[in-house]
């Protein structure tokens, strides 16, 4: 008898090379095999549970950056007046949540911010919990 | 044939709003659905393996805080003279371990320390390993 | 019917008590039960996917330390002129990758660097993905 296989874990790695002041960062998923999807510049959460979240990037100018998951809730990450980020966190997310950026720069110019090595990874930690597809 | 489901992963999120000087933090589990249990102000470990541990909180005064798992062993986290914590770690824990706080304040007063956003998350990383229930 | 068990997750904890200047750190796996293997002072990656990586250690002198996984690729961690490390990261690794250290000291002496509490943990986050054994 073949031993049971794991169903694929919900996870995604998105990249971002550009952030817009007073808006967010433009995210793209480099792989077609991701088990989570990007829609309207947000990562869509289908499965309830804890998520491991990794955020990295080097910015062309000083900015304040927050990563949100739900309107009216505090951010998953909040970084004030930084030129780079390399953070890891754990958060409980649920079906219908959407993970997205908010960015503010401190310059008078409203140019886009360029990003090197911009990467956001989400990995579900509670397979076996509720999912809605 | 129905694909196999994941058995639930051992994980828990506890909250704490108060810590007692020379003692620990009073932990409560907001959800009844947790797969791990709190007993005598400690999180009980039933399954051997690596655990992802996230610890957050904002304290009403400066304190030194340690998170222990076994008598005679070094702490999982140890923070000295802080007013907030936002840390992530990985540790190998085993059946019979108990995760609990120890707190010391540096004020002459022996008041309780109030905590905002106090949260401790443990997530088992080795399902399939030994568990004793 | 017995519920399906999890196949063991790919994970390993290695220890290192000594690093060689211009080379790497000598890693040993204290447990025979690890699901990943050490070969030629490197941790062998058999399974594609995200890995949670924890790196800790206290060094006898200041050094610069990098953790690599593939020739021609940037490091997983890179620390410059430190006497200790306590870092967590997430990275996508794949079959044929090998995780290994590179170390440089800034002293004229070419003595080995002694390490207290030197520990590197890797935990696969995408069971169910491709593995080659």
């Amino acid at each position: 008898q073949v031993p049971p296989q794991y169903p694929p874990i919900q996870s995604i790695r998105v990249q971002f090379t550009r952030c817009e002041n007073e808006k967010g960062c433009i995210i793209t998923s480099p792989s077609k095999d991701e088990t989570m999807k990007v829609q309207d510049n947000s990562i869509i959460i289908n499965c309830d549970g804890f998520y491991l979240i990794s955020l990295k990037g080097y910015f062309s100018e000083e900015l304040s950056l927050s990563l949100y998951y739900r309107k009216g809730r505090g951010p998953l990450f909040s970084l004030s007046k930084v030129t780079s980020v390399d953070s890891i966190g754990v958060a409980y997310l649920a079906f219908k949540d959407k993970v997205y950026f908010n960015v503010t720069t401190h310059s008078t110019s409203y140019k886009d911010i360029q990003v090197n090595g911009g990467e956001l990874i989400l990995i579900h930690q509670n397979p076996g919990g509720f999912c809605a597809y | 044939q129905v694909p196999p489901q994941y058995p639930p992963i051992q994980s828990i999120r506890v909250q704490f709003t108060r810590c007692e000087n020379e003692k620990g933090c009073i932990i409560t589990s907001p959800s009844k659905d947790e797969t791990m249990k709190v007993q005598d102000n400690s999180i009980i470990i039933n399954c051997d393996g690596f655990y992802l541990i996230s610890l957050k909180g904002y304290f009403s005064e400066e304190l030194s805080l340690s998170l222990y798992y076994r008598k005679g062993r070094g702490p999982l986290f140890s923070l000295s003279k802080v007013t907030s914590v936002d840390s992530i770690g990985v540790a190998y824990l085993a059946f019979k371990d108990k995760v609990y706080f120890n707190v010391t304040t540096h004020s002459t007063s022996y008041k309780d320390i109030q905590v905002n956003g106090g949260e401790l998350i443990l997530i088992h990383q080795n399902p399939g390993g030994f568990c004793a229930y | 019917q017995v519920p399906p068990q999890y196949p063991p997750i790919q994970s390993i904890r290695v220890q290192f008590t000594r690093c060689e200047n211009e080379k790497g750190c000598i890693i040993t796996s204290p447990s025979k039960d690890e699901t990943m293997k050490v070969q030629d002072n490197s941790i062998i990656i058999n399974c594609d996917g995200f890995y949670l990586i924890s790196l800790k250690g206290y060094f006898s002198e200041e050094l610069s330390l990098s953790l690599y996984y593939r020739k021609g690729r940037g490091p997983l961690f890179s620390l410059s002129k430190v006497t200790s490390v306590d870092s967590i990261g997430v990275a996508y690794l794949a079959f044929k990758d090998k995780v290994y250290f590179n170390v440089t000291t800034h002293s004229t002496s070419y003595k080995d660097i002694q390490v207290n509490g030197g520990e590197l943990i890797l935990i696969h986050q995408n069971p169910g993905g491709f593995c080659a054994y």
Partner: antibody
Framework: EVKLVESGGDLVKPEGSLRLSCVVS????????MSWVRQAPGKGLQWVAY????????SYTDAVQGRFTISSDNAKNTLYLQMNSLTTEDTAVYYC???????????WGQGTLVTVSS | SYVLTQLPSKNVTLKQPAHITCGGD??????VHWYQQKLGQAPVLIIY???SRPTGIPERFSGANSGNTATLTISGALAEDEADYYC?????????FGGGTHLTVL
């Protein structure tokens, strides 16, 4: 000199919305928790909401939970209170206050008046 | 939720001591802060951590806290001390104020 200046108070109809702002200066905004405290006409002080220094943690008094949202923008040194589904019971002067050690309120703004009436 | 009880009003003769109390279950285990609010003005922190005075607050203001009662004392009340006084603690991720005591200086 520490200064907190509230704005955004107005006359609004029941079930309406309002957003209050509090611009701070004289201290490093991103290092301190902040709160909103209100005072109904002729009544005592009532704590409304708290937000941590990094904006990641917040809490509310039961009376406003689910209707009010506290937020901050460290880039702009500004604290906000988004108030939805307002009722006449929300009529008050709203103060923003900086948290000190022991979670006291060591600096206050002068307040902004919110009137909910049809 | 935690409740702090204050008497609504208190009279004191000029230059005499005034004692304003704040009752709460085992309040002695908590840090109590006191605020003064004059008519038409924002509150001002006058005592923190039970008995400490911020810079600029006159020495006639002092505080104590034990058992189920915290006390604010004005050693010799002046006309300018006529105001509302509020006690405050933090409990279970929420701030709690007493109902306030209006002090009248006669």
């Amino acid at each position: 000199e520490v200064k907190l200046v509230e704005s955004g108070g107005d006359l609004v109809k029941p079930e309406g919305s309002l957003r209050l702002s509090c611009v701070v200066s004289g201290f490093t905004f991103s290092r301190y928790g902040m709160s909103w405290v209100r005072q109904a006409p002729g009544k005592g002080l009532q704590w409304v909401a708290y937000i941590s220094s990094d904006g990641r943690s917040s809490s509310y008094t039961d009376a406003v939970q689910g209707r009010f949202t506290i937020s901050s923008d460290n880039a702009k040194n500004t604290l906000y209170l988004q108030m939805n589904s307002l009722t006449t019971e929300d009529t008050a002067v709203y103060y923003c206050a900086k948290l000190g050690r022991g979670f006291n309120f060591n600096f206050w703004g002068q307040g902004t008046l919110v009137t909910v009436s049809s | 939720s935690y409740v702090l009880t204050q008497l609504p009003s208190k009279n004191v003769t000029l230059k005499q001591p005034a004692h304003i109390t704040c009752g709460g279950d085992n309040i002695g285990s908590k840090s109590v802060h006191w605020y003064q609010q004059k008519l038409g003005q924002a509150p001002v922190l006058i005592i923190y951590y039970d008995s400490s005075r911020p810079t600029g607050i006159p020495e006639r203001f002092s505080g104590a806290n034990s058992g189920n009662t915290a006390t604010l004392t004005i050693s010799g009340a002046l006309a300018e001390d006529e105001a509302d006084y509020y006690c405050q603690v933090w409990d279970s991720s929420a701030s709690v104020f007493g109902g306030g005591t209006h002090l009248t200086v006669l």
